[in-house]
């Protein structure tokens, strides 16, 4: 059969019935289902939504939902040992004490197991010491305190802000700089938009407000007891002092209203410049310790969480391809939440569950994708991405060979302005042209397409005409995908508007009042953002399922290769002297990129004139097309992070979030005006050139002509 | 023997825009070996590398800069030219022309070298 008889409609038939099927209605329904109790990681809750995702899914009609679960190491609170952050006096005595919990939202009084904010994974304890105001906690902030301030935090509880880069690496620079212990919080400059009330009369955070989220630096590794390997029946598990990523020092989130207890009575230095003052009626005086009158009062921290492996379940639904059914194209999204997930991530899984029942409708007709999708609702990723990671390490081998793309699918919204896409440079045309063919659901674009709107509100910084898409970071299930087994991956969701809302994320992550309301009430009542994410993700694996040639252009990886040449090199010759001294070119990394340019474009002109009736070379061309990402990873991975192995993108080393290009040379050249062994360091960036030009030619020759 | 020579105002108000042209001499400009850059040095501190362009036009800016830089080239005059936007008192310095050979930061002909002073 051809692959058209096979599919039984027209390709554009096929793309127009699925997206129509989508329906807002439907999305929002099962936002309301998934949201009215919390759903954390381990709980008996997300184990029952877990099998009803499961029973739907079957309804809907994929071939085959089966749970995966895992026995991982999750983290709680201690239910009868409650956590909280004191002042005390000179006595010993706790002159004020932290809220407990978060004041419940209207109509949730009554809903029991609503986790009471913690740091998961914090270890136990109760230091006590001098405050010391770190700021973002950002690398930057700690070269600020310690090196121009001269203000040393060993010993010192650190208070540092939510926002700007991924809390881990906030811990983790405060563990590096000898804190004892780290106090988080959310201030209103990062939390509170201007003009805007707080829940429930708004989308803003209130002062009793706290976000929660794990803490752990894992760099890749999943479950911290199994790294590499699944946590199964017969795993064999590290020691708790082995672990991979845990921290080392106690950690605890605080709202604002809490906040503004322990900084107003901050003293020592003054803020250095005004980028360290939030919106708070507060000194923002970095310390060490407190004021005049309460220089004798110390901070005490009481931490009594608990690390326990727990079961974990992850759903995975089948809808087998027609024509290659082992090929696979992945969908995946989160299902467990810190609370209710409003947004994290119920706004995603609900758009999935969505999308499923329209492939479904489909499937029922006698339609099936050329390609095998699967579906996966994933479990524990507040945990660190465990569910994802040790399902991908279950099946490494499988996804390594017959891994075509994998799409994200986290929350759907984070503002309602316009869209926002990270992905792999291979999908950027896709992207180009499937958000062409959807209709914009933006004020003032009525009849215009979202890709006019797009590219209107979020214009690329270096091509006019077009939209921003940024670099695939971390932070989510796309992770061990990309970052470690290199499948091409991407997401796609609905953002704020970053020129006028400076503050970090949306206010009310990871709260207790991410809640149905907020989505329905404030964020997209008629739930057109929602649809429209829902057109586009799934218009995304339809075209990567279904299409004859895969829909991957490899000259838009030749274009980005380049600008990240120019940009690594430009880095480096900031240090000329030294690059002069110890010989450092990057001439064989511009060669690679120049062959890869010219390898690609030859490549891309066979791919239009090659004869699409001969499955044998149909099948040929598309493997190259397939296989390009996975040419890019080095199977040692990068310095210190083995599940890393990317070698042009990795999640920066300072903020889990952002994607870094080269990140090898990138991570060798940074601060290396302060390395102890300048002959050493500078080897170690000739040592990533070397890596990042060979991995860049052998990629380019997976392109060539075959003999 | 390649020279090279700067040219512009030895003095620019602060928030102006600072201009310098480098004229090559004794050989050309339009050689994919090279780079052309420009590169100074304030008072009192060490070699600051500003930008780099080859023959093409295409241009390499130090990350910390590259906001107010704009390098250009003239292949038939054999020149290629420095703008620095916004100038402050901290962009005082001795600015060199300089060539470089490609992807490195072996600079192996320079310009004697312009004092630009920013001051009102």
């Known amino acids: 059969k051809s692959s058209n008889e096979a599919t039984n409609i027209t390709p554009k038939h096929n793309m127009k019935a699925f997206l129509d099927e989508l329906k807002a209605e439907n999305i929002k329904k099962f936002l309301y289902n998934f949201t009215q109790i919390p759903h954390l990681a381990g709980t008996e809750q997300n184990f029952q939504l877990a099998k009803q995702i499961q029973s739907q899914w079957k309804e809907f009609g994929l071939d085959s939902v089966e749970l995966a679960h895992y026995d991982v190491l999750l983290s709680y609170p201690n239910k009868t040992h409650p956590n909280y952050i004191s002042i005390i006096n000179e006595d010993g005595n706790e002159i004020f004490n932290t809220s407990l919990f978060e004041p419940p939202p209207p109509g949730y009084e009554n809903v029991s197991d609503i986790v009471p904010p913690f740091s998961a994974f914090s270890p136990q304890g109760m230091p006590e010491g001098d405050l010391v105001y770190v700021n973002y906690a950002r690398t930057e902030d700690f070269f600020k305190l310690e090196r121009d301030m001269k203000i040393n935090c060993s010993g010192k509880i650190v208070i540092a802000r939510y926002g700007k880069v991924f809390r881990g690496n906030k811990v983790k620079n405060a563990q590096l700089a000898g804190a004892k212990g780290v106090i988080l919080y959310s201030d209103p400059a990062d939390y509170f938009a201007p003009g805007v009330k707080s829940y429930p009369d708004g989308w803003n955070l209130p002062g009793g407000g706290v976000q929660r989220g794990n803490i752990l630096n894992l760099n890749g590794a999943g479950d911290p007891l199994t790294p590499g390997y699944p946590a199964n029946e017969y795993a064999y598990r590290r020691g708790i002092a082995e672990a991979v990523g845990l921290p080392s020092i106690p950690v605890h989130p605080i709202g604002y209203y809490d906040a503004q207890k322990l900084l107003e009575k901050m003293g020592g230095s003054a803020p250095p410049d005004s980028s360290w003052r939030g919106s708070l009626k507060v000194p923002y005086n970095v310390g060490p310790g407190f004021t005049g009158n309460f220089s004798t009062q110390k901070v005490k921290m009481h931490i009594h969480s608990t690390n326990e492996v727990t079961r974990i379940y992850n759903v995975i639904g089948t809808l087998r391809g027609a024509v290659e059914p082992d090929r696979y194209v992945i969908l995946g999204g989160h299902r467990d939440s810190w609370v209710f997930g409003g947004i994290d991530p119920q706004s995603g899984a609900a758009v999935v569950h969505e999308i499923v029942r329209s492939f479904g409708t489909l499937k029922k007709e006698g339609w099936r994708p050329r390609r095998t999708i699967l579906f996966a609702s994933w479990d524990a990723e507040e945990f660190g991405l465990l569910g994802s990671t040790e399902w991908a390490e279950e099946n490494s081998r499988l996804l390594q060979e017959r891994g075509v793309a994998y799409i994200n699918a986290d929350s759907s919204i984070e503002g309602n302005y316009t869209l926002r896409v990270d992905c792999t440079p291979l999908m950027y045309s896709l992207v180009h042209n499937l958000t062409k063919e959807l209709k914009s659901p933006d004020e003032g674009f009525e009849g215009k397409s979202l890709y006019e709107s797009w590219t209107k509100k979020s214009p690329s910084p270096e091509f006019s005409g077009m939209p921003r898409i940024s670099k695939l970071g971390s932070g989510n299930d796309f992770e061990v995908f990309f970052q470690r087994l290199g499948i091409a991956s991407g997401r796609a969701r609905y953002t704020k508007n970053w020129e006028t809302n400076k503050f970090s994320g949306y206010p009310l992550y990871h709260s207790v009042y991410e809640t149905y309301e907020l989505v329905e009430k404030f964020y997209d009542p008629m739930f057109k953002y929602h649809l429209t994410v829902a057109q586009v993700r799934g218009g995304m694996v339809f075209e990567l399922a279904n299409s004859i040639v895969l829909p991957f252009d490899c000259r838009d990886y030749a274009v980005v290769l380049r600008k990240y040449a120019d940009k690594i090199y430009s880095i480096s010759m900031k240090h000329p002297q030294e690059m002069k001294t110890y010989s450092v070119s990057f001439d064989s990394l511009f060669s690679a990129v120049k062959n890869f340019t010219e390898i690609a474009s030859k490549f891309s002109e066979r791919l239009q004139d090659f004869d699409k009736s001969n499955p044998i070379v149909l099948r040929m061309m598309n493997d190259q097309l397939m296989f390009l990402e996975r040419a890019f990873i080095d199977p040692l991975g990068l310095p210190d992070r083995p599940f890393y192995r990317h070698v042009i993108y990795a999640p920066s080393s300072h903020n889990k979030y952002a994607g870094e290009s080269f990140p090898g040379i990138y991570d060798a050249l940074f601060d290396i005006e302060s390395k102890v062994d300048p002959s050493k360091a500078w080897g170690e960036v000739k040592r990533q050139i070397y890596v990042a030009a060979f991995t860049v030619q052998a990629a380019a020759e997976t392109l060539s002509e075959v003999a | 023997q390649l020279q090279l020579q700067e040219s512009g105002p030895g003095l620019v108000k602060p928030s102006e825009t600072l201009s310098l042209t480098c004229t090559v001499s004794?050989?050309?400009?339009?050689?994919?070996?090279y780079y052309w850059g420009w590169i100074r040095q304030p008072p009192g501190k060490g070699l600051e590398w500003i930008?780099?362009?080859?023959?093409?036009?295409?241009?390499y800016y130090n990350p910390s800069l590259k906001s107010r830089v704009t390098i250009s080239v003239d292949t038939s005059k054999n020149q290629f030219s420095l703008k620095l936007s916004s100038v402050t008192a901290a962009d005082t310095a001795v600015y060199n022309c300089?060539?470089?050979?490609?992807?490195?930061?072996?600079?192996?002909?320079r310009g004697q070298g312009t004092l630009v002073t920013v001051s009102s």
């Open positions: 300089a060539r470089h050979k490609a992807a490195t930061a072996d600079f192996d002909y």
């Open positions: 930008g780099s362009i080859d023959y093409s036009g295409y241009t």
């Open positions: 004794g050989g050309s400009i339009s050689s994919s070996s």
